[in-house]
Interface confidence: medium
């Protein structure tokens, strides 16, 4: 289980002195600087128990593994649910603390209830301040049960929940109807996913038999030990005032753990520290009792004395939980409660024992979870103990679980169970990510998701040119930082793979999937300059440029022309994909716009230096279209066009332009200028006989205007092939009767 403890200071005379502290004993907990160690979170959870809004609570981080919540101004701030979240990845764990108001109408006899699947849970709310009204029970904020106020038994309202299942877990409350919810009794029900003494996906595995009130975790079979106890089975007491999975944490203040509630990962829940009891954890254990909430009884034998923090303290010559074992009986010494090895390694495990008669090599054996017994390959005999060494065959995942070292002599026997965790070396599930590239270097993010087990101790990046048979180059990197692969060849594909390792022998995982990363081309260095430009219409601009002459081939794939419209804050980019091009026509520009123009050479994705910019002003757009265009055939080679001037002209027309095209023809249209803008009629000559033509026209002021409607007309028949259309204008009033 994750080593995470939520401490609540219950000295409640002054809410301003109240604080909650979340302490993590996990390696690298709370760093928050990278994906390997997310930060500790400590917050009030208002989803179920809502309290009146007050000033925001203050969160203070003390080093990397501790966070404290303060700033409670009134007792109602304290009531409700608080949670601490710690651990990384799949080990991310939430620890929950439920706070009851000491002045509530109803108080829980016991706040945390941990029960097994299928058990009957009984929640008991003690009447503290009686009200003659019904009591309503809620589960996770939803009403689901009422009790008449006459139904109290011995001053308690009981809620029986038969055959509980994991979904029944959550926050329960008992409230007098029409009373403030802050006067409720709040409970936490934790339902283990298995029946008593079982764990695992199908609840097929047997729990190790947790001692001293430890609770077997239904997912991994580990004992979650009460505060003040440690070891695989919680068999070992910490020194007074200490807690954490390795007794590494110290209770704050001079009175040790008095007045503190300890909340641990589910399925443990919350309790007082070892040696303390009561709703505010301020009462010392009664004689003969010890442990968290003083729930354990000493029952010491053979002159042992009861210590309220650790249990029986045995006189010389005796040991055991109740001092029931004579020192003549052999005893396993200093066996680690938990060992970790990597998959497919062949570790050596030592087991030391003492006793009278003295244990010899053959009297010590090692038993695996599947029942296989290993005999020691050698033993080291010292005056006070014998240490047997066992060579373990290649480890498989099924070897994870509880192993047992057993010693047997004529004086008796002893055994010690310890947990072996077989860890799978990490294997990247994805290829590393390319962040940026240059012609001779690649910047890579090695941080990828992985299968198997952490923590990650080293990350190796292997790379070599694609399709190469040469040895891989390897670089060992910090997992949290991006890596720059240097001294590479330009425009070359490299195969790049990640290999992760975890601590311990055989911790190197298989290489992850390869990815192809290609270095960039050499950067183009030549700076072009703009030779000139001219406007070909209100929305068209022709641009020409040059490059300096240098020896050798041109490093470049083409040119990028950029037009910046500062008024509108818009950039137009035009790609000229030939490195030989020195001119380009830009169309679709906005008439009457002031553009800044430059050109630069590109090679692959890299841009060279930009030319000095030029400033270009496009003329404004032209006039509206001429109106009522009409065509009339005059002969086999002549058609007369008539029209009306455009309306709402912004200025005097300089000319008209007529477009002539053979209907259905594939050739380019012919444009004919009408240079006398006062004209409203013109004759187009030199047309082919019996041919259908399309005509449209537009006016020009500073720029060309919009096209008129298109009109169709056919020349008359039997004419000879003409040279091509020409035009003759005259005023519309003349010549229409010819």
């Amino acid at each position: 289980a994750v080593d995470l403890t939520l401490l609540a200071n219950l000295r409640l005379t002054d809410p301003q002195r109240f604080f909650l502290t979340c302490v993590s004993g996990e390696a690298g907990a709370g760093r928050g600087s990278d994906a390997w160690g997310p930060p500790l979170l400590l917050e009030k959870d208002d989803r179920i128990v809502r309290t009146p809004p007050g000033p925001p609570l203050r969160l203070a981080r003390n080093g990397s593994h501790q966070v404290t919540l303060r700033g409670f101004s009134k007792p109602s701030d304290l009531v409700g649910v608080f949670s601490c979240v710690g651990g990384a990845g799949a080990r991310r764990t939430r620890v929950i603390y439920v706070h009851n108001s000491p002045g509530a109408h109803l108080l829980p006899d016991k706040v945390t209830h941990t029960v097994n699947k299928g058990d009957t849970a009984v929640l008991s709310a003690r009447v503290h301040k009686e009200k003659q009204t019904d009591v309503i029970w809620k589960s996770n904020g939803s009403y689901f049960y009422t009790l008449d106020w006459h139904e109290a038994q011995d001053g308690r309202f009981l809620l029986q929940l038969p055959n509980v299942q994991p979904p029944s877990s959550g926050i329960y409350s008992a409230t007098y109807l029409e009373a403030s919810p802050l006067g409720s009794a709040f409970f936490r029900l934790i339902v283990r996913g298995c029946g008593a003494g079982r764990w695992g996906p199908g609840c097929t595995k047997e729990c190790p038999g947790c001692l001293h009130g430890g609770v077997c975790h239904d997912h991994d079979g580990e004992c979650v030990c009460p505060p003040g106890f440690t070891g695989t089975r919680c068999e070992q007491a910490c020194r007074e005032g200490r807690f954490g999975q390795s007794c590494q944490e110290q209770c704050p203040g001079i009175s040790g753990c008095r007045g503190l509630t300890f909340c641990l990962p589910d399925p443990y829940g919350c309790s007082c520290g070892s040696g303390w009891r009561g709703s505010q954890c301020q009462e010392a254990c009664a004689p003969g009792h010890f442990g968290a909430d003083c729930r354990l009884q000493c029952q010491c034998q053979n002159g042992g004395t009861c210590d309220r923090f650790s249990g029986c303290v045995c006189p010389s010559g005796w040991h055991g939980v109740h001092c029931e074992k004579s020192d003549r009986i052999p005893q396993i010494l200093n066996m680690a409660s938990e060992l970790e090895f990597n998959l497919e390694t062949m570790p050596r495990i030592n087991c030391a024992a003492a006793g009278n008669p003295f244990p010899v090599r053959g009297s010590i054996e090692l038993r695996k979870p599947d029942g296989t017994v290993l005999l020691s390959t050698k033993a080291i005999v010292e005056p006070e103990k014998t240490t047997a060494e066992f060579e373990v065959p290649r480890l498989v995942l099924a070897d994870s679980g509880f192993w047992e070292c057993r010693v047997s002599t004529s004086g008796g026997q002893d055994s010690r169970r310890f947990k072996v965790n077989v860890k799978v070396p990490p294997v990247p599930l994805a290829a590393p990510r390319l962040l940026t590239k240059q012609s001779r270097q690649l910047v890579v993010s090695p941080l990828v998701s992985f299968s198997g087990d952490g923590p990650i101790s080293t990350v190796r990046l292997h790379y070599r040119p694609q399709d190469s048979t040469m040895d891989w180059s390897t670089i060992v990197v910090d997992p949290s930082e991006n890596v720059t692969l240097m001294n590479l060849r330009p425009k070359t594909g490299y195969s790049v793979r990640v290999q992760l390792s975890r601590p311990g022998e055989g911790g190197e995982g298989a290489w992850g999937p390869p990815t192809l990363m290609t270095t960039d081309c050499p950067e183009p260095l030549l700076q072009p300059w703009l030779e000139g430009w001219h406007v070909e219409g209100t929305d068209r601009l022709r641009v020409s440029w040059s490059l300096p002459l240098v020896p050798g081939p041109l490093v470049g794939d083409g040119f990028l022309l950029r037009l910046w419209d500062g008024t509108r804050g818009q950039e137009r980019r035009e790609n000229v994909s030939s490195p030989q091009a020195r001119t380009a026509l830009l169309t679709g520009l906005t008439p009457g716009t002031h553009y800044q123009l430059d050109v630069q050479l590109y090679h692959c994705t890299l841009l060279g230096p930009a030319s000095p910019p030029a400033h270009v002003l496009l003329p404004p757009s032209g006039p509206p279209a001429p109106r009522h265009l009409h065509a009339q055939a005059l002969s086999d080679s002549e058609i007369q066009l008539t029209w009306k001037h455009p309306e709402a002209l912004p200025g005097p027309i300089s000319k008209y332009v007529v477009e002539v095209q053979v209907a259905g023809g594939a050739g380019d249209p012919l444009w004919i200028d009408v240079d006398r803008p006062e004209e409203t009629s013109t004759i187009i000559r030199g047309l082919n006989a019996s041919t259908r033509y399309l005509f449209r026209m537009r006016a020009s002021i500073q720029g060309l205007g919009d096209w008129s409607n298109t009109v169709e007309e056919s020349t008359l028949g039997n004419g000879l092939q003409a040279e091509g259309p020409v035009q003759e204008s005259r005023a519309a009033e003349e010549g229409l009767d010819q």
Epitope: D134, Y143, F144, T146, L147, E178
Partner: antibody
Framework: EVQLLESGGGLVQPGGSLRLSCAAS????????MEWVRQAPGKGLEWVSS????????YYADSVKGRFTISRDNSKNTLYLQMNSLRAEDTAVYYC???????????WGQGTLVTVSS | DIQMIQSPATLSLSPGERATLSCRAS??????LAWYQQKPGQAPRLLIY???NRATGIPARFSGSGSGTDFTLTISSLEPEDFAVYYC???????????FGGGTKVEIK
């Protein structure tokens, strides 16, 4: 002696409204939950609505939810039932009852007849 | 919602005989059940609460039994004033709804 006296019944057209009252005496009215129960002619009993001692909590049968409103005035020792959008099927004798221990009806009034007809 | 089914609908007996009335709930109501007596033109009267407890002033010939889904009201020896309609009533713990059975009429044979 506990006494409950209903009033306010009568003939009303469908869609109309009526307000029933129940005057209580002989007990501390503000300490008890109160109920309305009705009985259609020739039929069985049907619970209509409950109100808790201070009036803060009320419950209704699905058949009247949204149309009927139960209320009380503890200073006047009186229980009320405001009936809106009345239907023919609301025709019944309406009893007010005191809720005793365990949410049973230990005292009943004599009832008032409500007839909904056009 | 919990349904309450009473049987029989009518029970024809003579004074002095034993009457056994049944009430069945569609799901368990624990022991949260009451019995009421109603005479023509009168309001109902509480006889039994919590399945087996006699209300104040109720004669000993009335007794209730049962829990869960099956309940019985027994009148050990019928008196002339006992001929009436009898209703059972449950109260559920959530939602706090109250349901009556359809009633059993005990008439003189």
């Amino acid at each position: 002696e506990v006494q409950l006296l209903e009033s306010g019944g009568g003939l009303v057209q469908p869609g109309g409204s009526l307000r029933l009252s129940c005057a209580a005496s002989g007990f501390t009215f503000s300490r008890y939950g109160m109920e309305w129960v009705r009985q259609a002619p020739g039929k069985g009993l049907e619970w209509v609505s409950s109100i808790y001692p201070s009036g803060g909590w009320t419950y209704y049968a699905d058949s009247v939810k949204g149309r009927f409103t139960i209320s009380r005035d503890n200073s006047k020792n009186t229980l009320y039932l405001q009936m809106n959008s009345l239907r023919a099927e609301d025709t019944a004798v309406y009893y007010c009852a005191r809720r005793g221990s365990g949410r049973y009806f230990d005292y009943w009034g004599q009832g008032t007849l409500v007839t909904v007809s056009s | 919602d919990i349904q309450m089914i009473q049987s029989p609908a009518t029970l024809s007996l003579s004074p002095g005989e034993r009457a056994t009335l049944s009430c069945r709930a569609s799901q368990s109501v624990s022991s949260y059940l009451a019995w009421y007596q109603q005479k023509p033109g009168q309001a109902p009267r509480l006889l039994i609460y919590d399945a087996s407890n006699r209300a104040t002033g109720i004669p000993a010939r009335f007794s209730g039994s049962g829990s869960g889904t099956d309940f019985t009201l027994t009148i050990s020896s019928l008196e002339p004033e006992d001929f009436a309609v009898y209703y059972c009533q449950q109260r559920s713990n959530w939602p706090p709804a109250l349901t009556f059975g359809g009633g059993t009429k005990v008439e003189i044979k």
